[in-house]
Interface confidence: low
């Protein structure tokens, strides 16, 4: 090496093992700020998401036996909480210039856990929306007991599908030794098979984004059109938040799969990747923030009060295992999403 004391930062192109795909326009930086930007972002998500989701999970857990719909928020909060808790673990390789310190098992397991929780969160949100739609617009025979069973099944199905979506990541991950600079990396290796990569990307896009987005948006729209005359800001915020956080992530996946090597599009996508992944992760701390923001009037009383308000807003105020379902119109007037 000519520069024997080359300082290597994550995304620094001072190593020949990362020749300048990001320099197509000549704008190569010795230290790319976009590579280290995820660290403060991860810290913020962790600091907001852990207490926020813990609070929602605690409140939802307390009332889940009385309120069927609280089960949704309990699962959502648990998924988001696990995602937030795993962030410090995944921040270490970024801070260490891409070096993976957790071994081969960790390489398969840790990124898979975070993917599992992210997809579970997305799918649960979609299932919750569908449940609210069915509750409001569905047949009168759909009793609370039947719904309680259905919600449990749907939660299980969401986690199962999330697990299936995560399997390819675990299968195709492996440790990879780079020597210039020396670092052990946890990589996704499709073995040069573009068809496998395309299939994984397409399935993730359909089941992890497009499907849930259609479910969330259409259910929200149906509730707005059929059941409500007034604006429902929390529901709108949840839909918009979902789209804003996840659309760039899945768009990036499509770009990385189809973009021509050496294209300016691929170069920009690769540079933006850490922030886009961070934005997707930020979705895991979004729901508690929305609940607290839209329940800020109740915050004067207490934090749990705001969470209780959010629970009522998101599933029907008086619904419980004991009570008969009120008319759809009455119930939906108490609902969000």
């Amino acid at each position: 090496m000519g520069n024997d004391s080359v300082s290597y930062e994550y995304g620094d192109y001072s190593d020949l093992s990362d020749r300048p795909v990001d320099c197509l326009d000549g704008a190569c930086l010795a230290i790319d700020p976009l590579r280290v930007a995820p660290l403060p972002l991860y810290a913020a998500i962790f600091l907001v998401g852990v207490p926020g989701n813990a609070m929602v999970a605690w409140v939802a857990g307390k009332v889940a036996r009385r309120r069927v719909g609280a089960t949704w928020l309990l699962h959502l909060a648990v998924a988001d909480l696990l995602c937030c808790l795993s962030l410090p673990i995944l921040a270490v390789p970024i801070a260490r210039g891409g070096h993976w310190p957790y071994g081969a098992v960790g390489c398969r397991a840790l990124p898979s856990i975070i993917l599992l929780t992210m997809y579970a969160s997305v799918l649960l949100l979609a299932a919750l929306s569908a449940d609210l739609c069915f509750l409001a617009l569905g047949p009168a025979w759909w009793s609370t007991v039947q719904r309680a069973c259905g919600v449990q099944v749907a939660c299980g199905a969401a986690w199962t599908l999330a697990l299936l979506l995560t399997v390819p990541s675990a299968i195709y991950r492996r440790l990879h030794q780079e020597h210039f600079p020396a670092r052990l990396q946890c990589v996704v290796d499709y073995g040069g098979s573009s068809s496998t990569e395309n299939a994984v990307t397409a399935i993730r896009f359909l089941f992890g984004f497009l499907g849930p987005l259609v479910a969330v948006a259409s259910c929200h729209s149906a509730l707005l059109c059929w059941a409500a005359r007034r604006c429902r800001p929390l529901g709108t915020a949840i839909v918009v938040g979902f789209f804003v956080c996840w659309a760039p992530y899945h768009l990036l996946g499509l770009v990385l799969t189809v973009a021509a090597p050496n294209s300016a599009l691929l170069a920009r996508a690769l540079r933006a990747e850490p922030l886009i992944v961070g934005l997707a992760l930020a979705h895991s701390c979004l729901n508690p923030m929305l609940f607290l923001y839209f329940g800020r009037a109740q915050l004067r009383r207490s934090l749990p009060a705001a969470c209780h308000w959010a629970l009522r807003e998101s599933q029907g105020q008086d619904e419980s295992v004991d009570s008969k379902k009120s008319t759809s119109h009455d119930l939906v007037s108490e609902m969000e999403v």
Epitope: G26, G98, Q177, F180, D189, L270
Partner: antibody, heavy 119, light 112 residues
Framework: EVKLEESGGGLVQPGGSMKLSCAAS????????MDWVRQSPEKGLEWVAE??????????YYAESVKGRFTISRDDSKSSVYLQMNSLRAEDTGIYYC??????????WGQGTTVTVSS | DIVMSQSPSSLAVSAGEKVTMSCKSS????????????LAWYQQKPGQSPKLLIY???TRESGVPDRFTGSGSGTDFTLTISSVQAEDLALYFC????????FGAGTKLEIK
């Protein structure tokens, strides 16, 4: 059209010095990473040195076999890259190609200049 | 350094035949960040400088005839010429740019 033209080759005695030049045109030279690659019947193609652009502080890299003896430099105002070769050995004999580096490949090559180290 | 081994060292085929040549690296050339293999194939005709054919193991350089195909990942790579033409008489090199930059010794293609 990208064009790379090497010059400065010739016959030199072992231990002697020689400076190769490469004049570039047809692309934004100041943005480019430039490399020297040599070819000999004994060793085949062998990467020699690389100099990066201003954004990368004109960082230089060398093959182990030439480290401490060869120096790569550039003059962006003249769109030229140079290879100063000192303490030349018989094994340095070969055709020296100027190439535009980066992008994971050497997409553009000059026609080469022959360096012969012999007594 | 990563060692690149090419085989066979030479082969002679008739025009129109299919040709396959191999390149093996002493360690994986797959980049984690771009998920691409840092391997290129070059063609060097007699008396000329090398010309880029394939980069990132399988991406054909613009202007290269589609009879040239690169494949493989990790440590094993292949260059295939589906129907050899007389003008394909040349030396073919593989090159890795994953760790420093090293070339294979080349495969000499001769036309019968």
């Amino acid at each position: 059209e990208v064009k790379l033209e090497e010059s400065g080759g010739g016959l030199v005695q072992p231990g002697g010095s020689m400076k190769l030049s490469c004049a570039a045109s047809g692309f934004t030279f100041s943005d480019a990473w430039m490399d020297w690659v040599r070819q000999s019947p004994e060793k085949g193609l062998e990467w020699v040195a690389e100099i990066r652009n201003k954004a990368n502080n004109h960082a230089t890299y060398y093959a182990e076999s030439v480290k401490g003896r060869f120096t790569i430099s550039r003059d962006d105002s003249k769109s030229s890259v140079y290879l100063q070769m000192n303490s030349l050995r018989a094994e340095d004999t070969g055709i020296y190609y100027c190439t535009r580096g980066g992008y994971y490949v050497f997409a553009y090559w000059g026609q080469g200049t022959t360096v012969t180290v012999s007594s | 350094d990563i060692v690149m081994s090419q085989s066979p060292s030479s082969l002679a085929v008739s025009a129109g035949e299919k040709v396959t040549m191999s390149c093996k690296s002493s360690q994986s050339l797959l980049s984690s960040r771009t998920r691409k293999n840092y391997l290129a194939w070059y063609q060097q005709k007699p008396g000329q400088s090398p010309k880029l054919l394939i980069y990132w193991a399988s991406t054909r350089e613009s202007g290269v005839p589609d009879r040239f195909t690169g494949s493989g990942s990790g440590t094993d790579f292949t260059l295939t010429i589906s129907s050899v033409q007389a003008e394909d008489l040349a030396l073919y090199f593989c090159n890795q740019s994953y760790d420093l930059l090293t070339f294979g010794a080349g495969t000499k293609l001769e036309i019968k």
